[in-house]
């Protein structure tokens, strides 16, 4: 019999690389059975993630899997860092893994770094 | 169950280019990570890199940073490594291999394929 | 790049008997998210590696319970309680906290 607990599926050390001034959607994939949880999205800062309070957000209903977005119109170059979702059933706290946004300020397409050599420079988090 | 089936040439000259393909099956790469790993002739295991098939992106070892390209076909669900400027160190079983993003729960290895770099 | 260092590079054990390998990582394997990637494969000849254990101690499904993972940090190791004839097998540590992935240099478990 399938699991009726929160699932959040966003992959452990997931990645995306995304342009300054593009708009963007983090999204959160979450399964649940009944009733559908709190979820909300923060920002980490260290080891402490930082609640995103006023933030557009929005869910995207899908038939097995529903999606918990977190709007960037448009993306800035401070967007750039590691983001997580928690979702909150039962009195339980669901985390996610981390999802890491690499921010390229916008440049001339040929200046633009790749995505390889965005993930070889973990400096542009701090 | 999840499987993975290698495919590509045994054999490539040297300055050329290696080209090796791994088709899952058994899981919908998006929700995996696939990575590349090799084995030398009587060696032990090295990492080359692995994609996040969902958005393409990708992380090498450096020591082939330069070299490896590693790509993803979620319509076909399979994966692909490129090597290029192959000489003989680079003569090795080359394995693919997948995991479950989220949860570690599963992590399935190809069969491996047998490449020699050999004028 | 992390180094994993197992110990010994080679060991005979008697049928029955107990085997333990050891894996020292050169910096701690604990991640952010309090969870430690330490993962144990198993190659037997002519095969490709297999996964036993992950997450320091998890069994994969189908992994008889002979073998079990402990340690933490830097420190780990992985035990066959009473080895079998089909145990015979190089043994691989691997971390998945940090790129790049870096595997030891195996053991090689023989039957005596």
């Known amino acids: 019999k399938e699991s009726c607990d929160v699932q959040l599926y966003i992959k452990r050390q997931s990645e995306h690389s995304i342009l300054a001034g593009d708009p963007f959607e983090l999204e959160c994939p979450v399964k649940y059975c009944a009733n559908r949880p709190h979820v909300t999205w923060c920002k980490l800062n260290g080891t402490t993630c930082v609640k995103l309070e006023d933030r557009q957000t929005s869910w995207k209903e899908e038939k097995n899997i529903s999606f918990f977005i977190l709007h960037f119109e448009p993306v800035l170059p401070n967007d750039n860092g590691s983001y997580r979702c928690s979702a909150n059933f039962q009195s339980n706290l669901i985390e996610s893994h981390s999802t890491t946004l690499y921010v390229t300020d916008v440049k001339s397409a040929s200046e633009r770094p790749s995505k390889d050599e965005m993930a070889s420079r973990p400096w542009l988090l701090y | 169950q999840v499987q993975l089936q290698e495919s590509g040439p045994g054999l490539v000259k040297p300055s050329g280019t290696l080209s090796l393909t791994c088709a899952a099956s058994g899981v919908n790469i998006k929700d995996t990570y696939m990575y590349w790993v090799r084995q030398p002739p009587g060696k032990g295991l090295e990492w080359i890199g692995r994609i996040d098939p969902a958005n393409g992106y990708t992380r090498y070892n450096p020591s082939f940073k330069s070299r490896a390209t590693i790509s993803a076909d979620k319509s076909k669900n399979q994966a692909s490594l490129k090597l290029s400027s192959v000489t003989a160190a680079d003569t090795a079983v080359y394995y693919c291999?997948?995991?479950?993003?989220?949860?570690?729960?599963?992590?399935?290895w190809g069969q491996g394929t047998l490449v020699t770099v050999s004028s | 790049d992390i180094v994993m260092t197992q110990s010994p590079d080679s060991l005979a054990v008697s049928l029955g008997e107990r085997a333990t390998i050891n894996c020292k990582s050169s910096?701690?394997?604990?991640?952010?998210?309090?969870?430690?990637?330490l993962n144990w494969l198993q190659q037997k000849p002519g095969q490709s590696p297999k996964r036993l254990i992950y997450?320091?101690?998890k069994l994969d499904s189908g992994v008889p319970d002979r073998f079990s993972g402990s340690g933490s940090g830097t420190d780990f190791t992985l035990t066959i309680s009473s080895v079998q004839a089909e145990d015979l097998a190089v043994y691989y540590c691997?971390?998945?906290?940090?790129?790049?992935?870096?595997f030891g240099q195996g053991t090689k478990l023989e039957i005596k």
């Open positions: 997450l320091v101690s």
């Open positions: 691997w971390q998945g906290t940090l790129f790049p992935r870096t």
């Open positions: 910096q701690s394997l604990l991640d952010s998210d309090g969870k430690t990637y």
């Open positions: 291999a997948v995991y479950d993003g989220y949860y570690e729960s599963f992590d399935v």
